[in-house]
């Protein structure tokens, strides 16, 4: 499996779109900032075999896609940017799925690192709960946007390390 330069461009475009989606000054949202306890250790990538790392990355993209494709999300963000964001995420998920299929035959270890996948799921549950508690306010969405931008940049760095291993 080769996470190509095209995939790397997808990552950069995804981050760029996330940056463009900002609709409110973060300086007016300091009261709403929140620590979502991003599971950083799952993205360090050293302890993982490739198939496991890819499955964690895929889960991250899938959960991000789910979060931003809700009705509440559609109301919060610019429709055109959101559509572009979906396309980029969808493309990245396809690339990762292709990699997962290839890697299964190569490695004898279980495909899914259950604990890592669960950590990512719980992280997104914390984000969803926060949005509900804040009644999907503009500031809550801005805080979440900033958080997802950071987590996507961790994902991008892990993918870079995987590419270097190829």
């Amino acid at each position: 499996c080769n996470l190509s330069q095209t995939h790397s461009l997808n990552n950069r475009r995804t981050l760029m779109l996330m940056a463009q989606m900002r609709r409110i000054s973060p300086f007016s949202c300091l009261k709403d900032r929140h620590d979502f306890e991003f599971p950083q250790e799952e993205f360090d990538g050293n302890q993982f075999q490739k198939a496991q790392a890819i499955s964690v990355l895929h889960e991250m993209m899938q959960q991000t896609f789910n979060l931003f494709s809700t009705k509440n999300s559609s109301a919060a963000w610019d429709e055109t940017l959101l559509e572009k964001f979906y396309i980029e995420l969808f493309q990245q998920m396809n690339d990762l799925e292709a990699c997962v299929i290839q890697e299964v035959g190569v490695e004898e270890t279980p495909l899914m690192n259950e604990d890592s996948i669960l950590a990512v799921k719980k992280y997104f549950q914390r984000i969803t709960l926060y949005l509900m508690e804040k009644k999907y306010s503009p500031c809550a969405w801005e805080v979440v946007r900033a958080e997802i931008m950071r987590s996507l940049s961790f994902s991008t760095n892990l993918q870079k390390r995987l590419r270097r291993k190829d």
Partner: antibody
Framework: EVQLQQSGGDLVKPGGSLKLSCAAS????????MSWVRQTPDKRLDWVSI????????YYPDSVKGRFTISRDNAKNTLYLQMSSLKSEDTAMYYC????????????????WGQGTSVTVSS | DIVMTQAAFSNPVTLGTSASISCRSS???????????LYWYLQKPGQSPQLLIY???NLASGVPDRFSSSGSGIDFTLRISRVEAEDVGAYYC?????????FGSGTKLEIK
């Protein structure tokens, strides 16, 4: 290696204007918020302005609001501080600083600083 | 604005012994999210400030573990367990809880 190279400091008369620059290298400049902080002759640190990574949002304390303008050119990896209607109390060493990536907890720690550029306002 | 208060000088310390530097804020820096938005910076003679501690107790990258920080939300202490000659300089506390961000006036570490 992260580097912030500053320039533009000078001696100016009260009421005058000056533009400071901060050229960034060694990191993806467009992904980070930036600030200007000044150090007065009595060695106090005084935060002057902040700008978001994309440059759309800024904030200033009352002491400089309406006189100072922070801006950035992400294509040139450069941060600017346009200062006008300068007063003697603006005399200081001016530092540009990068903000650590904070995510949803908005951590505005300043993890890298420029070498500073000296501004003296005197007649 | 939140006012950060520091003593101008620390008690003189001998190299190899421990030192403490205090800082007080005019308002609690503990956010409802559980994070205390208190920071420590060190400015060595002739240099730019550098980040030492973020969010009250976390060591910045590359900072030796001789440094530690604790506090209550209003009163904060920076500790250096074994002072070295290179630790000399001015230590500034700062808050990022509210805008405008504010700094303490700085405490100079004095060596006996």
């Amino acid at each position: 290696e992260v580097q912030l190279q500053q320039s533009g400091g000078d001696l100016v008369k009260p009421g005058g204007s000056l533009k400071l620059s901060c050229a960034a290298s060694g990191f993806t400049f467009s992904s980070y918020g930036m600030s200007w902080v000044r150090q007065t002759p009595d060695k106090r640190l005084d935060w002057v302005s902040i700008i978001t990574s994309g440059g759309s949002y800024t904030y200033y304390p009352d002491s400089v609001k309406g006189r100072f303008t922070i801006s950035r050119d992400n294509a040139k990896n450069t941060l600017y501080l346009q200062m006008s209607s300068l007063k003697s109390e603006d005399t200081a060493m001016y530092y540009c600083a990068r903000h650590a990536e904070g995510g949803g907890n908005y951590d505005y720690a300043m993890d890298y600083w420029g070498q500073g550029t000296s501004v003296t306002v005197s007649s | 604005d939140i006012v950060m208060t520091q003593a101008a000088f620390s008690n003189p310390v001998t190299l190899g012994t421990s030192a403490s530097i205090s800082c007080r804020s005019s308002k609690s820096l503990l956010h409802s999210n559980g994070i205390t938005y208190l920071y420590w910076y060190l400015q060595k003679p002739g240099q730019s400030p550098q980040l030492l501690i973020y969010q009250m107790s976390n060591l910045a990258s590359g900072v030796p573990d001789r440094f530690s920080s604790s506090g209550s939300g209003i009163d904060f202490t920076l500790r250096i367990s074994r002072v070295e000659a290179e630790d000399v300089g001015a230590y500034y506390c700062a808050q990022n809880l509210e805008l405008p961000f504010t700094f303490g006036s700085g405490t100079k570490l004095e060596i006996k």
